[in-house]
């Protein structure tokens, strides 16, 4: 109960091409300290979609204010979805480390499917 859980409520989300996709993620604890990252895919070949700590991700916006004290909502919205964005997205909690942060726990993943743009 006390150990941090990463909850991605939806198993799957379907979005029409050109629209925005909201991928929801919540933590159950503020501990351990460390950033959140979103990836598409799992394993060594996974693609970084968003890094709370650093980087420029022009299509990604956070749904809530991540710097807000006691925030547990790490949902993101990805704009202008295309078929190339289809895949399984993982919300991953990292533990602050030196020199590098260490992966602590991953969400179960939300599969994003892309529907054809309505004509």
């Amino acid at each position: 109960e006390d150990e941090l859980q990463v909850i991605q409520p939806e198993k799957s989300v379907s979005v029409a091409a050109g629209e925005s996709a909201t991928l929801r993620c919540a933590m159950t604890s503020l501990i351990p300290v460390g950033p959140i990252m979103w990836f598409r895919g799992a394993g060594a070949g996974r693609e970084l979609i968003y890094n709370q700590k650093e980087g420029h991700f022009p299509r990604v916006t956070t749904v809530s204010e991540l710097t807000k004290r006691n925030n547990l909502d790490f949902s993101i919205s990805i704009s202008n979805i295309t078929p190339a964005d289809a895949g399984t997205y993982y919300c991953v909690k990292f533990r602050k480390g030196s020199p590098d942060d260490v992966e602590f726990k991953s969400g179960a993943g939300t599969e994003l499917s892309v529907r054809a743009k309505p004509s």
Epitope: Q8, E10, T28, G109
Partner: antibody, heavy 122, light 112 residues
């Protein structure tokens, strides 16, 4: 230790509304889904809907869509279920149930309230 | 919605003997992640339901090891290796792969 304490029994007239509360203590309230499950006398279990307080939006079973409203107040760690246009068939025990530590919403219900009997009678 | 069908409806048991309850779903509960989204609950007389088994075969905290869950896809079984008097009540399976979650009709276990 997670505990869910529900409001007391209610007797309602047909056509009226009822609002049942479920106060959680122990553990994190905001991030876990809270569901409402009802049980008519001598019958089985029926999921009505649920909410993850941190996100605010609720999911409803189609059968109850438009008649049930599920809300949550993070400041008091309390979830609510309001059922409107009551009829005699809504006489049941209404349970709130909280998710366990699974990665998805409504994956399994690890903690249950004691139940609230709602009787609809003219 | 996914339809869950349990059998038998009623199960008279002898203490110390094994018991088995079947649950079938109208569509597969096996997710691409390898988990079966099938849970088992017990509702003892006059009490709220309690979680016994989640994700097909995982015993919930505090549940005795005489309870076990098995199966995959659309066919699942709850087994009690040696029934005790305190195991009486109604057992429900529930699918959790889709929203809304849906329950089986229940199996009433009673002592012979």
């Amino acid at each position: 230790q997670v505990q869910l304490v529900q409001s007391g029994a209610e007797v309602k007239k047909p056509g009226s509304s009822v609002k049942v509360s479920c106060k959680a203590s122990g553990g994190t309230f905001s991030s876990y889904a809270i569901s409402w499950v009802r049980q008519a006398p001598g019958q089985g279990l029926e999921w009505m809907g649920g909410i993850i307080p941190i996100f605010g939006t609720a999911n409803y079973a189609q059968k109850f869509q438009g008649r049930v409203t599920i809300t949550a107040d993070e400041s008091t760690s309390t979830a609510y279920m309001e059922l409107s246009s009551l009829r005699s068939e809504d006489t049941a025990v209404y349970y709130c149930a909280r998710d366990g530590g699974g990665g998805y919403a409504y994956e399994y219900f690890q903690h249950w309230g004691q139940g609230t009997l709602v009787t609809v009678s003219s | 919605d996914i339809v869950m069908t349990q059998s038998p409806l009623s199960l008279p048991v002898t203490p110390g003997e094994p018991a088995s309850i079947s649950c079938r779903s109208s569509q597969s509960l096996l997710h691409s992640n390898g988990y079966n989204y099938l849970d088992w609950y017990l509702q003892k007389p006059g009490q709220s339901p309690q979680l016994l088994i989640y994700l097909g075969s995982n015993r919930a905290s505090g549940v005795p090891d005489r309870f076990s869950g098995s199966g995959s896809g659309t066919d699942f079984t709850l087994k009690i290796s040696r029934v005790e008097a305190e195991d009486v009540g109604v057992y429900y399976c529930m699918q959790a792969i889709g929203v809304p979650p849906t329950f089986g009709g229940g199996t009433k276990v009673e002592i012979k």
